[in-house]
């Protein structure tokens, strides 16, 4: 292991659906891949109307996007689809949702709302 | 091992679609990203866009916006590629590759768009 | 977006080293250790010889390393051999937030 960095070797797995693909439907997947590569977990879920449906958990390729990361965490604006990776053995055991807010320089003068 | 087998060529006329499609193996389908590159007769690589096979979250570079759509089918492992609104300039070899490092290619697959 | 800018040619003896350059800008090449390099041979699709800055995939002879300084990412071949005349692209990871981007390709002709 690499000083200061979890190595991913294994990932919570689910497949909602395992029916289809011939899979388990949970479990504990281990990661494989090229040595030279890392290796996360990752979390996939959908929101409907308020109510949170796992679509996949397992590991995720080498990706910068999830380099140390210890917590699995989505941070896109309301995707249709939820997604987040992080490092470390079973680290999307749990997941979550914080939008980054984008804070974008107003391109003219910012418009002023009319009083009621 | 990792394969990523692509579709066989095509001739098209300008103004219609063609749809590439990129079969992978040998690894969980599921666990990354496939990108697609193009490369036009003595020219060099140009990325097109990407997509997040488990999520089907996609980024498309600027210049194909609103002409490419990236889509991903879990049940077969299979990407796909489809460019509309076609013309000469479009004529190319076009690669799927795995991974946000394009660690894996395609053989790639030529587009001739011609009347 | 824009594409990172290589020399067109280089060339080099059987035997010397040569170094192929990448200049981007500090949102890409300059932000982050996501640079590629890869190799490619005429009718073939490419072949990765060095992902993030300067890790080398398994199979790719430890003649060929990468590095960067500023916003300039550099290829280095030593003890050059014909079969290493090919195209050399650089190019960025994509995927998430990240968007792809290549450098123009560089003719490596092996004297």
């Known amino acids: 292991a690499i000083l200061g960095r979890s190595e991913t070797q294994e990932c919570i797995f689910y497949n909602a659906n395992w029916e289809r693909d011939r899979t388990n439907r949970t479990g504990v997947e281990p990661c494989y891949g090229d040595k030279d590569k890392r290796r996360h977990c990752f979390a996939t879920w959908k929101n409907i109307s308020g109510s949170i449906e796992i679509v996949k958990q397992g590991c995720w390729l080498d990706d910068i996007n999830c380099y140390d990361r210890t917590d699995c965490i989505e941070k896109k604006d309301s995707p249709e689809v939820y997604f987040c990776c992080c490092e470390g053995n079973m680290c999307n055991e749990r997941f979550s949702y914080f939008p980054e807010m984008e804070v974008t320089q107003p391109t003219s003068n910012p418009v002023t709302p009319k009083p009621p | 091992q990792v394969q990523l087998v692509q579709s066989g060529a095509e001739v098209k006329k300008p103004g219609s679609s063609v749809k590439v499609s990129c079969k992978a193996s040998?690894?969980?389908?599921?666990?990354?990203?496939i990108n697609w590159v193009r490369q036009a007769p003595g020219q060099g690589l140009e990325w097109m866009g990407t997509i997040n096979a488990v999520s089907g979250s996609t980024s498309y570079a600027q210049k194909f916006q609103g002409r490419v759509t990236i889509t991903a089918d879990t049940s077969t492992s299979t990407a796909y590629m489809e460019l509309s609104s076609l013309r000469s300039e479009d004529t190319a070899v076009y690669y799927c590759?795995?991974?946000?490092?394009?660690?894996?290619w395609g053989q790639g697959t030529l587009v001739t768009v011609s009347s | 977006q824009s594409a990172l800018t290589q020399p067109r040619s280089v060339s080099g003896s059987p035997g010397q080293s040569v170094t192929i350059s990448c200049t981007g800008t500090?949102?890409?090449?300059?932000?982050?250790?996501?640079v590629n390099w890869y190799q490619q041979h005429p009718g073939k699709a490419p072949k990765p010889m060095i992902y993030g800055v300067s890790r080398r995939p398994s199979g790719v002879p430890d003649r060929f390393s990468g590095s960067k300084s500023g916003n300039t990412a550099s290829l280095t071949i030593s003890g050059l051999q014909a079969e290493d005349e090919a195209d050399y692209y650089c190019?960025?990871?994509?995927?998430?937030?990240?968007?792809?981007?290549f450098g123009g390709g560089t003719k490596l002709t092996v004297l």
């Open positions: 590759a795995r991974g946000g490092w394009f660690d894996y």
């Open positions: 190019g960025t990871f994509a995927g998430g937030k990240y968007y792809g981007v």
């Open positions: 040998g690894y969980t389908f599921t666990s990354s990203y």
């Open positions: 500090s949102s890409d090449v300059g932000s982050a250790n996501y």
